[in-house]
């Protein structure tokens, strides 16, 4: 009679993480008698996957029933397979023997490997905000999946980016793997509404990439430009000076008026206008009673933007020699010049 | 669903032979391995041995050869453990347990006193 | 014949405590046939850990399972009053198969 032998049929089977692996195996005698086991792996560090008469493996279960007479398929099936599960495994006869039983004959062995999907790709900007013209960098992280093949684009704005470093971990075999990806983008005043996207494609998503977004909003901080002008006078006495302050992001502001370098008022940005670009517009005034002064007057508009040092500009108002004598009643004649900076 | 029923409380005197059963029911008595387990009062558990159903064969562990004999009956489904010569070290709670090892029969106590 | 050591024989632990128990075995133990069982008096023994990490059907996520070779251990992240019990491990690497002589654990 023929010396039994154990038939796996296939090489290697591809599973998706989540489904079930059936693992064929078949013998060609009944004797000797014996049990059958499964393992993963060979040699002294193999696991055991299935035994057909002792221990507990709760995700296996039996293609055929075992204890019916003549049978020979010792197939299984293992349920929601994870990356954890890749490996080869082998169909093992053994003999029965005293004190263990004997391992008679092992199958070639099935290389059960497992496609998993990677995790949604996590985009992460900079700590902290940076002004147009600067290079903010960009990273991307995805988990989990297998096999080692992906492939990671950079786009912002639809348009692809070039600037960009990526790595899969571990360079090794693995049962999953991660990929980490850092790109450069350099920063233009338009940015408050871009946005950048990283996409993943892999085997497992079946040409429907994963994509991971981040706003350049949270990146960018654009400061404001200032611009103090006389306006029209309301009375003979008084002067009324405007803070233009322009196209900055984000929102948070304060605004300070000094008048020749003493604080006379403090307000926070409130009711602003917001620009096609998405950038803010606001502007604050300042009633003079040019009456109070006998000398001209340095009117000044601090900003602090953003938690950033202050930006401010200053103007002078010329209380003229006529006004200066007669007081308000010449509050008209009173001009308002432009000084550098302070 | 899967039980194991064992026999009931048996006090026996010393010398004597018992024979404890366990009745499997909701799963094939041959696809598994049978274990008897021992379990003295208030102290740990002590495996005796296995039976194969399908074919008899049958391990035991040094301590119980020659004291402990284990059979099987597929007919009845049912699994026995038979004990010799019994004296009061004899006295404890006897287990059968599945070989997949996560059911176990609610256990028979023996007693040996005279 | 592989020894089974358990310790401690007996310990105590406060509500919310970590609990670490260990298994020595005399010889090297596969970790796929290295199995724990829990016990509460007047009850069959409940299978618990099975192949040194996987946890049986019903257990808490705070019980877990680890070790290799000769040294293997069961830990509760943080001890329930209702894991007041005896812990068993267990050897089917090879013939005669072996309990550990338990770790009665109480409440405090």
């Known amino acids: 009679e023929d010396e039994l032998q154990v038939i796996q049929p296939e090489k290697s089977v591809s599973v998706a993480a989540g489904e079930s692996a059936t693992l064929r195996c078949a013998m060609t005698s009944l004797i000797p008698v014996g049990p059958i086991m499964w393992f993963r792996g060979a040699g002294a560090g193999r696991e055991l996957i299935y035994n057909q008469k002792e221990g507990h493996f709760p995700r296996v279960t039996t293609v055929s029933e075992l204890t019916k007479r003549n049978n020979l398929d010792f197939s299984i099936s293992i349920s929601n397979i994870t990356p954890a599960d890749a490996g080869t495994y082998y169909c093992v006869k053994f003999r029965k023997g005293s004190p263990d039983d004997v391992e008679f004959k092992s199958g070639a062995g099935t290389e059960l490997s497992v496609r998993a999907k990677p995790s949604a790709p996590v985009v992460s900007g900079p700590a902290v905000r940076a002004t147009p013209e600067h290079t903010v960098s960009f990273t991307c992280e995805s988990h989990g999946f297998s096999p080692r093949d992906i492939t990671l684009k950079w786009f912002k704005n639809g348009n692809e980016l070039s600037d960009f470093q990526t790595n899969v971990d571990p360079a090794g075999d693995s049962v999953s793997y991660s990929i980490h990806s850092t790109a450069r983008v350099v920063l233009t005043r338009g940015d408050v509404h871009s946005q950048v996207i990283c996409e993943i494609a892999h085997i497992t998503l079946q040409g429907d990439p994963l994509r991971g977004t981040a706003n350049l909003s949270e990146a960018i901080r654009v400061p404001p430009t200032l611009e103090v002008t006389q306006q029209p006078m309301r009375a003979e006495n008084q002067a009324n000076v405007t803070c233009q302050v322009s196209n900055f992001y984000p929102r948070g502001l304060q605004l300070t008026w000094l008048e020749n370098g003493n604080v006379s008022r403090t307000e926070t940005a409130s009711t602003l206008i917001e620009n096609k670009d998405g950038t803010y517009n606001w502007m604050s005034w300042l009633l003079v009673n040019t009456c109070a002064h006998r000398d001209d007057v340095v009117l000044t508009c601090q900003v602090e933007h953003d938690g950033q040092q202050a930006v401010s500009k200053s103007y002078a108002l010329e209380i003229s020699a006529h006004q200066k004598e007669h007081g308000s009643d010449i509050t008209h004649e009173a001009a308002l010049a432009p000084t550098a900076p302070l | 669903e899967v039980q194991l029923q064992q026999s009931g409380v048996e006090v026996v005197q010393p010398g004597a032979s018992v024979k404890l059963s366990c009745t499997a029911s909701?799963?094939?008595?041959?696809?598994?391995?049978m274990h008897w387990v021992k379990q003295r009062t208030e102290q740990g558990l002590e495996w005796i041995g296995r039976?194969?159903?399908?074919?008899?064969?049958?391990k035991y562990a040094p301590k119980f050869q020659g004291k402990a004999t284990m059979t099987a009956d597929t007919s009845s489904s049912t699994a026995y453990l038979q004990l010799s010569s019994l004296t009061s070290d004899d006295t404890a709670v006897y287990y059968c347990v599945r070989g997949s090892y996560e059911y176990w029969g609610q256990g028979t106590t023996l007693t040996v006193s005279s | 014949q592989i020894v089974l050591t358990q310790s401690p024989a007996i310990m105590s632990a406060s509500p919310g405590e970590k609990v670490t128990l260990t298994c020595s075995a005399s010889s090297s133990v596969s970790s796929s046939y290295l199995y724990w069982y829990q016990q509460k008096p007047g009850s069959s023994p409940k299978l618990w850990i099975y192949s040194t990490s996987n946890l049986a059907s019903g257990v808490p996520p705070r019980f877990s399972g680890s070790g290799s070779g000769t040294s293997y251990s069961l830990t509760i992240s943080s001890m329930q009053a209702e894991d007041a019990a005896s812990y068993f491990c267990y050897q089917w690497s090879s013939y005669p198969y072996t309990f550990g002589g338990g770790t009665k654990l109480e409440i405090k």
């Open positions: 909701g799963f094939n008595i041959e696809a598994y391995y």
């Open positions: 039976i194969d159903p399908e074919d008899g064969e049958s």
